[in-house]
């Protein structure tokens, strides 16, 4: 019988004739930075090349006995999960192992850095096909380790790492906190976050997605035919490294940004029980479990977008938070969120030649998050159009006036401390979908993009009575690019995108009372690219 | 930048009072920063990654490392360069006393210094 974890990552629309890319990852090389491995295990024999790289600290304690099978345990299992003959994800992938963890599973930041440098030098000396680097390890936040990962990622290498087994915010650990790395949390057979002893999987905005990571059967270093169950975010990361190898083997030209977007797109959505996470982390943690694409074709035509949350701004009056997209992505919209509801909105602004999303805290606020909607939009030309606060009582409005530019997102930012508390709602006139509307005291920012075949439409969902949450989703074939709340709703905590759904959150109804200001409207901007669709059809 | 410390092996003996000051301040008036792991049991004091500014060449990295060794020796401290980084990040890994951090942070080309720390299998 197929182990539960391999079944879980197999797409539901499984069809044997189109499920596996050629040779399941054969065009890809996966580097594993871990313990030593038992390379003659029948699961991985001939698939893993042990490099001569070794940089490990001495084992702790006088009573520690080096036992080969114990020393090889972690690395052997992970190599098996990635490419094992019976229990591997990418059975065709070839691997290279570097020893950066000792027999106790302990290493150093410096040893890991030297290992990453070794990979870069190997890549320069002998360029091969796509490279995936699996980092099934974690330490405390490290600026230098994150920087090294960033450099390697910008050299075209896909890095996949464990979120960490500390039942904590993954942003406090490295390399999990490096934005360029694909960071993976662990779930079990019941799609619950994994508990490990008193701790468990890490979570939060630095996690990209989850994958099977509990009771994973793989190669055991106890003997060359042995298997064992191991658990952890390392196992989860190994699944994603295997999936990445499969995807890159099918489409070797995929960039890191494209691969990440596809991993997110093909994940199972909203299956994780979020109650396991601390309350303040639930909104930040992606509810995604990795899966293989149902087919090697047909993904190219879609407009892929993902949501990127900033770090928390902190509570000071002028505090701001910034969310950034990856270098190959376009920022198509920007929103903000504050648990206290005290915020001064958000704006898109240029920083280092690239647009970023900045959210502003308000006096008495506990802090804000900026939420960027980051999309893959080839040949895009995007700009921000701003309207300063209006004099007229109808409110501020701004639209995309350039020929061929479409509206992908709306943001509003205000200087007054508590906008809208005593203001009547402002309704956007019907029949004018290509414009953003806001309070007269707010400046409004429209994200306007031109890209071949790009078309967008506005979709609203309004609820007259107070609700803690109002959502509006884009239909099949359309991708959510913008998410905002219609102005006039004073108790709005903010808006953010979850997959293809725009979520507008309001204060607890009991604190606001059911007044005329209770009306909440969520506004989604849904886009699609006819150009990408046509290009995909031509390829097929 | 050209190295001004000349022959390092001789320097320990041939000291001039002017040279006994701290190394010249980093360019652009920016101050290099020191980082260490927030989780105390995971810290590995005594080993430091000295990260140099982005465009620093390998030869400059080696010179900066030698300069640190020379200036540390003048103060009676032994240091050991464990690795010189190039390819990903310019810099070097050094085994030294934490007492030398202030000195190291003032070396030319230094962007930041990070104390080594543990990583663990997950």
């Amino acid at each position: 019988s197929i182990p539960w974890n391999l079944e879980r990552i197999t797409p539901p629309r499984y069809r044997a004739d189109e499920y596996q890319p050629p040779d399941g990852g054969s065009l890809v090389e996966v580097y594993l930075l871990d313990t030593s491995i038992q390379s003659d295990h029948r699961e991985i024999e001939g698939r893993v090349m042990v490099t001569d790289f070794e940089n490990v600290p001495e084992e702790d304690g006088t009573r520690f006995h080096r036992q080969a099978s114990k020393c090889d345990s972690h690395g052997t299992h992970l190599a098996g999960v990635v490419s094992g003959r019976d229990a591997g994800v990418a059975k065709g992938a070839s691997m290279r192992s570097l020893r950066v963890l000792n027999c106790q599973g302990k290493g150093t930041v410096s040893g890991t850095l030297i290992g990453l440098e070794f990979i870069r030098k190997s890549q320069l000396v002998q360029p091969v096909g796509p490279l995936v680097v699996l980092l099934p390890l974690a330490g405390g936040y490290s600026r230098v380790l994150n920087a090294a990962c960033q450099r390697l990622a910008r050299a075209g290498v896909v890095l996949v790492t464990a979120a960490g087994n500390f039942r904590d915010d993954a942003c406090l650990y490295s390399p999990a906190s490096a934005p360029e790395v694909i960071t993976v949390g662990a779930t079990n057979a019941q799609d619950q976050p994994v508990t490990l002893g008193t701790l468990g999987t890490n979570f939060g905005r630095c996690v990209d997605l989850f994958a099977p990571g509990e009771d994973i059967i793989g190669a055991s270093s106890d003997c060359s035919t042995c298997f064992v169950s191991q658990s952890g975010t390392s196992q989860a990361a190994a699944h994603v490294a295997g999936i990445a190898a499969m995807m890159l083997s099918a489409e070797p030209e995929l960039t890191l940004a494209e691969l990440r977007q596809r991993l997110i797109h093909f994940s199972a959505k909203d299956v994780i029980n979020e109650a396991w996470f601390p309350e303040d982390q639930r909104v930040l943690t992606p509810n995604l479990v990795a899966a293989l694409p149902p087919s090697t074709h047909g993904a190219g035509w879609q407009l892929f977008c993902r949501t990127v949350w900033s770090a928390h701004s902190g509570p000071t009056r002028m505090a701001t938070a910034v969310a950034r997209c990856a270098p190959d992505e376009e920022l198509l919209s920007c929103s903000s969120f504050s648990r206290s509801g005290k915020r001064r909105g958000e704006r898109m602004e240029a920083q280092g030649g690239k647009l970023v999303c900045r959210a502003h805290n308000a006096f008495g606020g506990e802090g804000v998050y900026a939420i960027a909607r980051c999309c893959l939009l080839p040949q895009a030309n995007c700009s921000v159009h701003t309207a300063p606060p209006a004099e007229a009582s109808m409110g501020t409005r701004v639209h995309c006036h350039q020929q061929g530019h479409v509206l992908t997102g709306c943001s509003s930012h205000w200087e007054v401390e508590d906008l809208g508390t005593h203001k009547p709602p402002v309704l956007r006139p019907r029949g004018q979908p290509n414009q953003c509307v806001g309070h007269r005291e707010a400046s409004i920012h429209a994200s306007c993009c031109h890209a071949p075949g790009l078309e967008c439409k506005v979709k609203e969902h309004g609820i007259p009575a107070p609700q803690e949450q109002v959502t509006v989703a884009c239909e099949e074939g359309w991708t959510l690019t913008g998410c905002s709340a219609l102005p006039g709703t004073s108790h709005v905590l903010g808006a953010y995108a979850v997959d293809n759904t725009c979520v507008v959150r309001s204060r607890d109804v009991s604190t606001t009372g059911s007044t005329s200001e209770g009306a909440v409207t969520a506004v989604a901007i849904c886009c699609r690219s006819r150009h990408l669709a046509q290009a995909s059809q031509e390829l097929q | 930048q050209e190295d001004e410390d000349g022959d390092y092996e001789e320097l320990v003996l041939a000291l001039r009072s002017e040279e006994d000051g701290l190394a010249e301040a980093p360019e652009h008036g920016t101050t290099a920063t020191f980082h260490r792991c927030a989780k105390d049991p995971w810290r590995l004091p005594g080993t430091y990654v000295v990260v140099l500014k982005e465009e620093t060449h390998l030869s400059q990295s080696e010179r900066t490392a030698r300069r640190l060794q020379a200036q540390a020796a003048r103060r009676g401290y032994l240091t050991k360069i464990l690795h010189v980084f190039h390819g990903l990040l310019p810099g070097f890994l050094v085994k030294m006393s934490g007492d030398l951090l202030e000195l190291a942070l003032k070396l030319p080309h230094v962007d930041y210094i990070e104390e080594d720390s543990s990583v663990f299998a997950q």
Partner: antibody
């Protein structure tokens, strides 16, 4: 679905020997510890012995130590219980069971997380009587 | 060896009742405790592991709690299929012991 099938039970005289077998399916068999559990007529469950994945570690209940030997053959996906010097009090239904558990790392220590005996055979009856 | 004591030995209840079975360990076993259900002539079935984690496929009316030496199995609303014998089992250093069992019968 993993299935366990016991065989080898029967009637044996006190002092005699018997070898029980448990056949399993799939690589999942070799991935976990395995146990033998017995149940005397009208009585409760009693754990007898268990064995690690590779057979390198074995544990027994005090009452069978020195008389019973647990073993496994990974190639044949089989678990065995060799019972010598049998006594009347060894009369019971003998079950083989999979000990589902997993190993994980935390800060440089290698830990075992036990879930319980999640797959059981149908049992084989051993009667020790003269 | 660690001894496990279950109470009561027998429990009479009706469909829809909430029932609780207790298990005491002779020394602390942290949370390393499992609960099983056994019907006459059948092999036991795992219900709860690590004191409170529900095994996959087991109805949510079954729940476990406790740590150290005191543990309980609770069935929130008895169903006809729940009348059986229940056993607790401790795990400690790769050797196990079961409780003597609690027979749950129809009142």
């Amino acid at each position: 679905e993993v299935q366990l099938v016991e065989s080898g039970g029967g009637l044996v005289q006190p002092g005699g020997s018997l070898r029980l077998s448990c056949a399993a399916s799939g690589i999942t068999f070799s991935s976990y510890w395995m146990s033998w559990v017995r149940q005397a007529p009208g009585k409760g469950l009693e754990w007898v012995a268990n064995i690690k994945q590779d057979g390198s570690e074995k544990y027994y209940v005090d009452s069978v130590k020195g008389r019973f030997t647990i073993s496994r053959d990974i190639a044949k996906n089989s678990l065995y219980l060799q019972m010598n010097s049998l006594r009347a009090e060894d009369t019971a239904v003998y079950y083989c069971a999979r000990d589902r558990g997993t190993y994980y790392y935390q800060e440089g220590s290698y830990n075992y997380y036990y879930y319980g005996m999640d797959v059981w055979g149908q049992g084989t009856t051993v009667t020790v009587s003269s | 060896d660690i001894q496990m004591t279950q109470s009561p030995s027998t429990l009479s209840a009706s469909v829809g009742d909430r029932v609780t079975i207790t298990c005491r360990a002779s020394q602390s076993i942290s949370s390393w405790l499992a609960w099983y259900q056994q019907k006459p002539g059948k092999a036991p079935k795992l219900l709860i592991y690590k004191a409170s984690s529900l095994e996959s496929g087991v109805p949510s009316r079954f729940s476990g709690s406790g740590s150290g030496t005191e543990f309980t199995l609770t069935i929130s609303s008895l169903q006809p299929d729940d009348f059986a014998t229940y056993y607790c089992q401790q795990y400690n250093s790769y050797s196990y012991t079961f409780g003597q069992g609690t027979k749950l019968e129809i009142k």
